[in-house]
């Protein structure tokens, strides 16, 4: 399709590097997290820091590139490096409009995200919406 | 200062391929934005042909798509279009342009290419 | 793909007018609010010039008299008061679908 991607933008204080220039920031008002509509790609990207059982968004935006993982509908995470002892980066890609905004699972740090494995897990009914 | 500068054949034959090669002076190509091809035939309107961004993504308009090709040489800091099986339609001022987001903020002078046996 | 048609085709006015040229879009050039239309200046022989971006961003450079408004499919650029080098060729271009398409072009011409 020609329209172009829009996602969720966020970058954690401290954070190095930035995806900024991989899209253009929307303004969305208030009541929805800061967007960036997509430049090269059609595709989202999200990574959260997992510490013991708390998860906490680093970044969120646009891909560079549309490459494996960014045809998925979702934002389904899966482990990539220890940054530190006990911390885990969990990463996913995919390719909706706003579809980094928040996961419905993180995989244990141990596993490698396969479908059945538990991590911090919203409500019944709700996921985990990063506010931003 | 940032420069762009196309250069190129002013003449092509029908059914060859046109070349055209755009050297960017006074910035980086593989730091950051998209680099583009435009072209106006004689007299009327602009229409964009594709980019190829600083980290390598490629668009291409889909009415050119099956005959353009832009790539890019980072060792001269360059961008090329080739534009293949050409006829007298092709006739243009072609421009290579930077993109800042989606929008054209700095251009080349243009070079005319006629298309003519 | 997404056509831009502007009007009037040609705008014949005298240097201190008020220009106001428009450019309607087939479709929506919003998205979440935020509208992808820009302008462009064209002088015989030359390159494009970038005046306005996303509507009514005036480029850095740009005379304030220059202006851009609209959301949605209708947009004008208004030039306050026309100083001499303001006659030229006046091109909207829209870039939230792809392929990026241009209008046909505004001459403001003098009178």
């Known amino acids: 399709p020609p329209n172009r991607r829009t996602c969720v933008f966020f970058e954690a204080p401290g954070v190095q590097g930035s995806t900024k220039t991989l899209g253009e920031l929307l303004d969305t008002g208030p009541e929805l997290p800061r967007a960036i509509r997509c430049l090269y790609s059609r595709c989202c990207f999200g990574i959260w820091n997992l510490t013991q059982d708390r998860a906490q968004v680093e970044m969120q935006g646009c891909r560079d590139s549309d490459e494996p993982g960014c045809e998925s509908l979702h934002c389904d995470p899966s482990p990539r490096a220890h940054p530190s002892p006990g911390s885990t980066l969990f990463t996913c890609s995919c390719g909706t409009d706003f579809c980094n905004a928040n996961y419905s699972h993180l995989p244990p740090p141990g596993s490698p995200g396969t479908p059945g494995s538990q991590g911090p897990q919203a409500a019944p009914g709700e996921s985990i919406w990063m506010a931003l | 200062q940032l420069q762009l500068q196309e250069s190129g054949p002013g003449l092509v034959k029908p059914s060859e391929t046109l070349s055209l090669t755009c050297t960017v002076s006074?910035?980086?190509?593989?730091?950051?934005?998209?680099w583009n091809w435009i072209r106006q035939p004689p007299g009327k309107g602009l229409e964009w042909i594709g980019y190829?961004?600083?980290?390598?993504?490629?668009s291409y308009n889909p009415s050119l798509k099956s005959r353009v090709t832009i790539s890019v040489d980072t060792s001269k800091n360059q961008f090329s279009l080739k534009l293949s099986s050409v006829t007298a339609a092709d006739t243009a001022v072609y421009y290579c342009?930077?993109?800042?987001?989606?929008?054209?903020?700095?251009w080349g002078q243009g070079t005319l290419v006629t298309v003519s046996s | 793909e997404i056509v831009l048609t502007q009007s009037p085709g040609t705008l014949s006015l005298s240097p201190g007018e008020r220009a106001t040229l428009s450019c309607s879009a087939s479709e929506s050039v919003d998205t979440y609010g935020n509208s992808f239309m820009h302008w462009y200046q064209q002088k015989p022989g030359q390159a494009p010039r970038l005046l306005i971006y996303?509507?009514?961003s005036l480029e850095s450079g740009i005379p304030d008299r220059f202006s851009g408004s609209g959301s949605g499919t209708d947009f004008t650029l208004t030039i306050s008061r026309l100083e001499p080098e303001d006659f030229a060729v006046y091109y909207c271009?829209?870039?939230?679908?792809?392929?990026?398409?241009f209008g046909g072009g505004t001459k403001v011409e003098i009178k």
């Open positions: 190829i961004s600083y980290s390598g993504s490629i």
């Open positions: 006074g910035y980086s190509i593989t730091s950051d934005y998209a």
């Open positions: 342009a930077r993109s800042r987001y989606s929008w054209f903020d700095y």
């Open positions: 271009q829209q870039s939230n679908e792809d392929p990026y398409t």
């Open positions: 996303r509507a009514s």
